[in-house]
């Protein structure tokens, strides 16, 4: 009789993570008597996967009827495959003895595991930035195999070109990770903008995974200020408004100064939203001009999102308004708490 041969017909097998892998092995002879064993890897550090003779291998089942001696098929099925199962599997015939001795090995079957990448996670800069600045976004995805993967960046559907991508590790591994950094130039219109990282992989069957970041979490649009004097609403009263326009985010504190002295501080509440996502707000002051002998310098000072304050001033000409006789004296003489400047916002 011809000497036994161990035949592993498949050089390689590719399986999706979570599925079962069938590794084929047949022998050409019934002799010598002795068990078949399956190993992952070769050499002294090889890992026992299945032993026909003994042991508990909960994930491994034999494909053929192993209780018949004429059965020469020693194929096995390994359930619930993970990337950690990747490697070369050898079907090995042993000769019965004490100890059992390796008689002949198959050529090996390389098992590769197709594992889906994790959902891409996009993260932006730690601090907000203003329009015309360039900010970096990172995208990470892990646990995929094989190594080949495609990553693209988009801003509002337009593909970006300024990015750098790395896939790790460089050498062989059971699974891989991708890391990409894209540079994005901010504009004043970016409050509603999105940055998208798109990952395509063989396991995704043409349906790429996407991770997004909203630029609303990254951008800061500083406000523009305009202080205007409105027509007189009543005798000796002037309405001064401070228009705070096109700012984002909403966090804003406004302080009115009268000749450099703090008159009133308020926080933006009932703002109006523009189509581009920025906000507008208006604050007003009602000034009793008869309470002032000289011109008044009114300053609207705005602190936006914790940034250094910006301000706009308006000179109120007192001489242009005839004073009501004794009104100033009354205010001074009585030491009254009655305010001479009234304000509001909207």
């Amino acid at each position: 009789e011809e000497e036994l041969q161990v035949i592993q017909p498949d050089k390689s097998v590719s399986v999706a993570a979570g599925e079962s892998a069938i590794l084929h092995c047949t022998v050409t002879s019934l002799i010598p008597v002795g068990p078949i064993q399956w190993f992952r890897g070769a050499g002294p550090a090889r890992e026992l996967i299945y032993n026909q003779k003994e042991g508990h291998f909960p994930r491994v089942t034999t494909v053929s009827e192993s209780t018949k001696r004429e059965n020469m098929d020693f194929s096995i099925s390994i359930s619930n495959i993970t990337p950690a199962d990747a490697g070369t599997y050898y079907c090995v015939k042993f000769r019965k003895g004490s100890p059992d001795t390796e008689f002949k090995s198959g050529a090996g079957t390389e098992l590769s595991v197709r594992a889906k990448p994790s959902a891409p996670v996009v993260s932006g800069p730690a601090a907000r930035a203003t329009p015309q600045h360039t900010v970096s976004f990172t995208c990470e995805s892990h646990g995929f195999s094989p190594r080949d993967i495609t990553l693209k960046w988009f801003k509002n559907g337009n593909e970006l070109s300024d990015f750098q991508t790395n896939v790790d590790p460089v050498g062989e591994s059971v699974s891989y990770s991708i890391h990409s950094t894209a540079k994005v130039v901010l504009t004043r219109e970016d409050v509603h903008s999105q940055v998208i990282c798109e990952v395509a992989h063989v396991t995704l069957q043409g349906d790429p995974l996407r991770g997004t970041a909203n630029l609303s979490e990254t951008i800061r649009v500083p406000p523009t200020l305009e202080v205007t004097q409105q027509p007189v609403r009543a005798e000796n009263q002037v309405n001064v408004t401070c228009q705070v326009r096109k700012f984002y985010p909403q966090r804003l504190q406004l302080t009115w100064l009268e000749n450099g002295n703090v008159s009133r501080t308020e926080t933006a509440s009932t703002v109006t939203e523009n189509k581009d996502g920025t906000y507008n707000w208006m604050s007003w002051l009602l000034v009793n001009v008869s309470a002032h002998r000289d011109d008044v310098k009114l300053t609207c000072q705005v602190e936006h999102d914790g940034q250094p304050a910006v301000s706009k001033s308006h000179d109120l000409k007192v001489s242009a308004h005839p004073k009501e006789q004794g009104s100033n004296t009354a205010a001074e003489n009585t030491g009254s708490n009655e305010r001479n400047i009234y304000g509001g916002s909207g």
Epitope: L30, V33, K68, R69, N71, S98, P99
Partner: antibody
Framework: EVQLVESGGGLVQPGGSLRLSCAAS????????MHWVRQAPGKGLEWVSA???????YYTGSVKGRFTISRENAKNSLYLQMNSLRAGDTAVYYC????????????WGQGTMVTVSS | DIQMTQSPSSLSASVGDRVTITCRAS??????LAWFQQKPGKAPKSLIY???SLHSGVPSKFSGSGSGTDFTLTISSLQPEDFATYYC?????????FGQGTKLEIK
């Protein structure tokens, strides 16, 4: 059903011959190592002989040169030709199938009695 | 030849008892050890192979252990049908050899 049935036992004089047969059913005999085991009256079990799938044969020392194991694949049968029989060969002879991969005995026949006496 | 020695040669026990029979090989036999049960006038029945694997249909009250030269057969809770003679056998190399047997009797 997997079964082994021995036949051919009987009374024979010392120096005589006897041929035991074992008919297998439910499996292909040629695919298994097959054995003969005997048990003298009131004694323990003793392995006698084996034939491998390649036709290789094995014997215990006391029967070497006197007994011959063989098989006939067409009849799915195993045989033990016993020559130069001695009183010490008196026993029940069992036909036994070796296991799938390690030759562990799994199926036994009911046995046939061989008595060597003058 | 490899010698197989069983102990004890006979053993008295009661229904419900747990009993252990030992078998020692004269040299290392890996785990190529089998256990058989035989009742008077009947053919032996295969119980265990490769020291600890149960043959199909054998109840789990039978268990085997050991490797190398020392082996045991344990019956966890004796029933009337378990009173019989038990044999161990090495089948690592020819000639295959049996132990002399352990007769398990009812007390």
């Amino acid at each position: 059903e997997v079964q082994l049935v021995e036949s051919g036992g009987g009374l024979v004089q010392p120096g005589g011959s006897l041929r035991l047969s074992c008919a297998a059913s439910g499996f292909t005999l040629s695919s298994y190592d097959m054995h003969w085991v005997r048990q003298a009256p009131g004694k323990g079990l003793e392995w006698v002989s084996a034939i491998g799938t390649a036709g290789d044969t094995y014997y215990t020392g006391s029967v070497k040169g006197r007994f011959t194991i063989s098989r006939e694949n067409a009849k799915n049968s195993l045989y033990l030709q016993m020559n130069s029989l001695r009183a010490g060969d008196t026993a029940v002879y069992y036909c036994v199938r070796g296991g799938v991969w390690d030759d562990a005995f799994d199926i036994w026949g009911q046995g046939t009695m061989v008595t060597v006496s003058s | 030849d490899i010698q197989m020695t069983q102990s004890p040669s006979s053993l008295s026990a009661s229904v419900g008892d747990r009993v252990t029979i030992t078998c020692r090989a004269s040299q290392d036999i890996n785990n190529y050890l089998a256990w058989f049960q035989q009742k008077p006038g009947k053919a032996p029945k295969s119980l265990i192979y490769t020291a600890s694997s149960l043959h199909s249909g054998v109840p789990s009250k039978f268990s085997g252990s050991g490797s190398g030269t020392d082996f045991t057969l344990t019956i966890s809770s004796l029933q009337p049908e378990d009173f019989a003679t038990y044999y161990c056998q090495q089948y690592v190399s020819y000639p295959y050899t049996f132990g002399q047997g352990t007769k398990l009797e009812i007390k």
